[in-house]
Amino acid sequence: IFPLAFFIYVPMNEQIVIGRLDEDIILPSSFERGSEVVIHWKYQDSYKVHSYYKGSDHLESQDPRYANRTSLFYNEIQNGNASLFFRRVSLLDEGIYTCYVGTAIQVITNKVVLKVGVFLTPVMKYEKRNTNSFLICSVLSVYPRPIITWKMDNTPISENNMEETGSLDSFSINSPLNITGSNSSYECTIENSLLKQTWTGRWTMKDGLHKMQSEHVSLSCQPVNDYFSPNQDFKVTWSRMKSGTFSVLAYYLSSSQNTIINESRFSWNKELINQSDFSMNLMDLNLSDSGEYLCNISSDEYTLLTIHTVHVEPSQETASHN
């Protein structure tokens, strides 16, 4: 299995390889097979990455930053493969690598441009700050700087704040949006153009539900087909907002098909789950169950948030007793 990296062919013996932070990659290089093979990989024409001649590695002059991180495909060298297997790439490894191959027949040099991208799975969070409601799209570690776009009811929003902190390796980005008093649906897209990877967060507010004490409530949560792929691992979490913080009622992991329920009155329909319907029931409502309920369906490529507001009112009996 080849490590995650893809090659873009460009003219003049130069290829572009795109790798992900901390993953392994292959810098490709091939030559016309011949005897007495010599292979030297260099970085930015200065630093010795890997040397092979007389049938074995010679790493005495290897730059320390490459120690224990490089190897060749030794069984393939006689077939003209001088590719370099490169472990755990970092952003500092970005740049131009030159592969020098000498044989009894000829000497060739190939250039490979390594670009490294980072895209730790972003998240969409719903937060209450005093009387304001915010949606926050954030990504803990991303490189290069991503493109973040917001839409309200499928219409792009021009103004969007971006709070950015840069570390040695990458950016950490928060993009908050004030949605106080809005009933619209919102979508946030974060795109890493280098890794050609896009993540989407979608937030939908459902109509408020009024229920009487002791009744049960059914809250819907179905993924939008545009984003949802049942083959992909995902997690579903139902939580309830109480005094500004969410407490988890239940969650479901698609990988293990496990359901964990923290609230005895909560129920999930197994058959509906198998049809990718994560609607839930909350039985025997009491007044303290009033509040906001959040269904979060998340995978590496999306987060779908559905908010329900439930108002539980005293039943007639309870009212007459008072």
């Epitope: 007495e36 010599v38 001649y53 007389k54 020098y100 000498g102 044989t103 009894a104 000497v107 040099t109």
Partner: antibody
């Protein structure tokens, strides 16, 4: 075709210096390690010095270490040997030699050589 | 340092003869050995590399064999153009030439 032409030889007194040059043509000079090899007429061959294809490493025979310096100018396709503190035993024909590859390989092309005579 | 002992130092032979020149290394050099031919007033010419690989363009009557410490250069049928001095070169650790074998007409 590969051509290596040495120059700069001559008669020099012991203790003095001399700089040999080698003009290379017919190949991509920067892709190959280069060497200097000397031969006393009627006697055997002795390897003198090596410079890697990229100039990053240089090696010398014990007999010349600390006195001779090998260098290259890839933009001019030229190899140099700076010889100082010359001794009578350095008298020889000095040949510029191309290695088949980058360093520590066999020699595949030789120049005709330039005579260096160290004598008072 | 690795010493190379070449024998014989002089070899008299006739056209059509099969001749063998030997090179012995003071320690193992694997197969990192080359053979050169030099004619008076000329630069040495590569014949064999890596003990037994024939350089492109060199006549097939030349062959090399051996590994470790014992190596031979064989000319299967001497031609008039083959009378010259032959040198072995070890390139396993730095470089050392043999003293040379002068091949002359008997």
């Amino acid at each position: 075709q590969v051509q290596l032409v040495e120059s700069g030889g001559g008669v020099v007194q012991p203790g003095r210096s001399l700089r040999l040059s080698c003009a290379a043509s017919g190949f991509t000079f920067s892709n190959y390690a280069m060497h200097w090899v000397r031969q006393v007429p009627g006697k055997g061959l002795e390897w003198v010095a090596l410079i890697w294809y990229d100039g990053s490493e240089k090696y010398y025979a014990d007999s010349v270490k600390g006195r001779f310096t090998i260098s290259r100018d890839d933009s001019k396709n030229t190899l140099f040997l700076q010889m100082s503190s010359l001794r009578a035993e350095d008298t020889a024909v000095y040949s510029c030699v191309r290695e088949y590859s980058s360093g520590w390989g066999y020699f595949d092309y030789w120049g005709q050589g330039t005579q260096v005579t160290v004598s008072s | 340092d690795i010493q190379m002992t070449q024998s014989p130092s002089t070899l008299s032979a006739s056209v059509g003869d099969r001749v063998t020149i030997t090179c012995r290394a003071s320690q193992s050099i694997s197969s990192w050995l080359a053979w050169y031919q030099q004619k008076p007033g000329k630069a040495p010419k590569l014949l064999i590399y890596k003990a037994s690989s024939l350089k492109s363009g060199v006549p097939s009557r030349f062959s090399g064999s051996g590994s470790g410490t014992e190596f031979t250069l064989t000319i299967s049928s001497l031609q008039p153009d083959d009378f010259a001095t032959y040198y072995c070169l070890q390139y396993n650790s730095y470089y050392t030439f043999g003293q040379g074998t002068k091949l002359e007409i008997k």
